[in-house]
């Protein structure tokens, strides 16, 4: 069998959901000494980066300006050290948002419920879309999908305080082209946990693993600020179809 280098890690900086006309940044973490990185899009070569000097950094950032539906889709990357190529990275789905229209998100029976109550979110968009997506802030990898002509239901079942947080929905024109986000709906769950006022809520900042921390090779500092490898469990297959 042909010898290959270990596969790189591909990640979107900040978010994999990029508003149209904004810049997407994809990071490919390979190896110190890599002389070339290739970004592939839907199985075809998209861009090539040859870092200078090659031996000083363990990855590269591919900047994709002017995001649009033609650049949205599945990306992967590979790298080369000498004449030896790596295996291909996992796939990363890059989504363009702020396309066309804005849906409306509502929640039944209301935004303030008691633990154990059944809650359903409704996402409505009066344009040609049949797939809807519900995301919780700070949990953008956990996308819930539902289908409907102009409205989709997202039954949450009996909720707990873990469901507390801010939610948004999108209409999807295809797997990689989403509408503008809805206005957020904040779900407040009061419950039978002792001292619910101190129960933790989910962070509303972007997913902590959506960060590119490429490191320069500087002797003793080489091992500092390495990528958060706990994130590797989250970054791929985040919303495969």
């Amino acid at each position: 069998p042909k010898q290959t280098l270990p596969k790189p890690i591909i990640r979107a900086e900040s978010t994999y959901m990029v508003p149209k006309e904004k810049q997407a940044t994809l990071c490919c973490q390979g190896s110190y000494g890599a002389v070339e990185y290739q970004l592939h899009f839907e199985g075809s070569l998209f861009a090539v980066e040859r870092p200078k000097p090659p031996e000083r950094i363990n990855g590269v950032k591919f900047h994709i300006p002017d995001m649009n539906s033609r650049k949205a889709g599945r990306y992967s990357c590979i790298y080369r050290v000498g004449e030896l190529w790596s295996e291909r990275s996992d796939l990363l789905d890059l989504v363009v948002t702020e396309m066309y229209d804005t849906p409306t998100l509502s929640v039944h029976p209301g935004p303030e419920v008691t633990s154990g109550e059944k809650v359903t979110f409704y996402c409505r968009l009066d344009t040609a879309t049949s797939m809807f997506l519900l995301l919780k802030e700070g949990r953008s990898r956990d996308v819930q999908r539902s289908y409907g002509k102009v409205q989709a239901e997202f039954p949450m079942g009996p909720v707990t305080t873990a469901h507390r947080g801010s939610y948004r929905c999108f209409g999807s024109y295809n797997n990689y082209a989403w509408s503008f986000p809805s206005e957020p709906v904040k779900l407040l769950v009061t419950g039978d946990i002792e001292n619910t006022s101190l129960a933790p809520t989910d962070p509303t900042f972007p997913d902590s693993w959506d960060t590119c921390l490429l490191t320069r090779e500087t002797g003793l500092q080489k091992d500092l600020a390495l990528w958060d490898h706990t994130a590797q469990n989250h970054h791929h297959h985040h919303h495969h179809h």
Partner: nanobody, 127 residues
Framework: QVQLVESGGGLVQAGGSLRLSCAAS????????MGWFRQAPGKEREFVAA????????HYADSAKGRFIISRDNAKNTVSLQVNSVNLEDTAVYYC????????????????????WGQGTQVTVSS
Amino acid sequence: QVQLVESGGGLVQAGGSLRLSCAASGRTFSRYSMGWFRQAPGKEREFVAAISSSGDVTHYADSAKGRFIISRDNAKNTVSLQVNSVNLEDTAVYYCAASLTARATTVTVHPNGYNYWGQGTQVTVSS
């Protein structure tokens, strides 16, 4: 906004050489990765060669390696494609394209990554 105008096409004999040029308008030319694509009759548009905004990095299609040389002059806002030992399969419309890149060492290859396109110049190779 970048406007691209190709020149240098025409009728060339097999075995000869030609040089295609692309003139770009605008003061931001040095921020763009530049590429050449071609489309033969009845075929899809295909990547030929590309060069990074700095000119330091080039990338060629397998079919172009060895015979094609891409270069650029950021002072003159031009990118050129030298084609040597032309053959009948090189008959096509050749397009120049510009891709905005954030890094001087990035080369864009995929047509979807290009923001601006020229109108093309016809190259016909005769035997």
